[in-house]
């Protein structure tokens, strides 16, 4: 944020650039928080807009038991790697195809015992306030899929009739980790000494981190045709005076009629 | 990348043999898996017959065992199907696959490599 600054008063404004802010031979630049020719008022909002999307990622594990482990396998550039990988990605697709969340797998490692497979499940959701709630439902259809098919498609005989087979007691879940955004937190954060006055209400299931000087949310206070200024003690309106009246109180809204002061000073001399 | 030239096909009496081959080039390993799959008019297409390269294992449908010998030539890196007393029931288009993985499948969708199909017609 930035103002910019004319004529002779400006080498006395360098000085005086307020809150960190930093002069550029023109004007005073602003720290994010704030704004002005002296960066000496508080912005009334601030940007947290959320990531588009929130990211989940399963480490689990599987043992393949229609392919023969090769020490070619560990190798990832080895044909037989590419291969393998190519298969087991297209078989989980199938796995997970119903699960809107999915976005893939990635194999992290494979050893030996028929074949281990060590994979991660890629899972993606748009941001919305209930991300966590949609995270872990996808996360638990992933359980239930990966149990189903490691149960169903398994060794007849020594032979598989599916694309791929399973060990029914190899498959694990290590470990779930989910991005994690905590609107209200990086709110605070960012509002630095002002946190205790900043909220996140939103709109169209988008956060803002507004205080209570930005019009148009419930937290708004109304300072009627005052200005709403944040301090360190929390917001407050600032009133005006106009060519006939002064006004008063804590958000402007008593206003007194300057011709009866006016006249009643007169009356007094 | 792996590339599959199938041959041998023809027509021929029930009772009677044919030999199929299949070239395969493109492999940077000695240790894979090779197959014979077939496809009927009108039907899904169906392994006949599987092996490793190594010598490890060989598969063989109910349908054909006893009847027909899968085999492999490392030096020559082709593959072979030897078909005896043959049925009219073996008509179909003979397809050979392969994989660099040591597959213990008999479903297509896990084999990526295919060769065209060559027709074999047992017909009096």
């Known amino acids: 944020r930035t103002t910019t600054c004319f004529g002779d008063g400006c080498q006395n404004t360098a000085s005086r650039c307020k809150n960190g802010g930093t002069w550029d031979g023109l004007k005073c630049q602003c720290p994010n928080l704030y704004y002005g020719e002296l960066c000496e008022e508080v912005v009334s909002s601030i940007d947290i807009g959320p990531p588009e999307t929130i990211s989940a990622q399963m480490e689990l594990t599987v043992t393949v038991t229609s392919v023969k482990f090769t020490e070619e396998l560990k190798n990832h550039s080895s044909q037989e790697f590419q291969e393998f990988k190519q298969t087991f990605t297209e078989q989980m697709n199938i796995v997970y195809s119903g699960i809107p969340e999915y976005v893939g797998v990635n194999i992290t490692k494979l050893r030996l015992g028929s074949v281990v497979v060590e994979h991660d499940v890629l899972l993606r959701t748009k941001y919305t306030p209930e991300y966590k709630t949609v995270l872990d439902n996808a996360t638990e259809v992933v359980k239930e899929k990966i149990t189903k098919v490691t149960t169903q498609q398994i060794m007849i005989n020594d032979i598989c009739s599916d694309m791929m087979c399973f060990n029914t007691t190899g498959t694990q879940v290590q470990n779930i980790t989910v991005t994690q955004y905590d609107p209200e937190e990086d709110c605070r954060k960012m509002a630095k000494e002002y946190g205790d006055y900043f909220v996140v209400e939103y709109r169209d299931q988008k956060p803002y981190c507004i205080s209570p000087c930005e019009p148009g949310f419930s937290v708004s206070k109304n300072c009627n045709l005052g200005k709403c200024q944040m301090s360190l003690s929390g917001p407050q309106c600032l009133c005006v005076t106009t060519e006939t009246h002064w006004y008063s109180g804590e958000t402007c809204n008593q206003g007194t009629q300057k011709s009866l002061v006016y006249g009643h000073h007169h009356h007094h001399h | 990348d792996v590339q599959l030239q199938a041959s041998g096909g023809g027509v021929v009496q029930p009772g009677g043999s044919l030999r199929l081959s299949c070239a395969a080039s493109?492999?940077?390993?000695?240790?894979?898996?090779m197959a014979w799959f077939r496809q009927a008019p009108g039907k899904e297409r169906e392994v006949v017959a599987f092996?490793?390269?190594?010598?490890?294992?060989?598969y063989y449908a109910d349908s054909v065992k006893g009847r027909f010998t899968i085999s492999h030539d490392n030096s020559k890196n082709t593959l072979y199907l030897q078909m005896n007393s043959l049925r009219a029931e073996d008509t179909a288009v003979y397809y050979c696959a392969a994989s660099s993985l040591l597959l213990q499948t008999i479903n297509p969708r896990a084999w990526p490599y295919w060769g065209q199909g060559t027709m074999v017609t047992v017909s009096s």
């Open positions: 493109g492999y940077t390993s000695n240790r894979y898996s």
């Open positions: 092996i490793w390269t190594d010598g490890g294992r060989t």
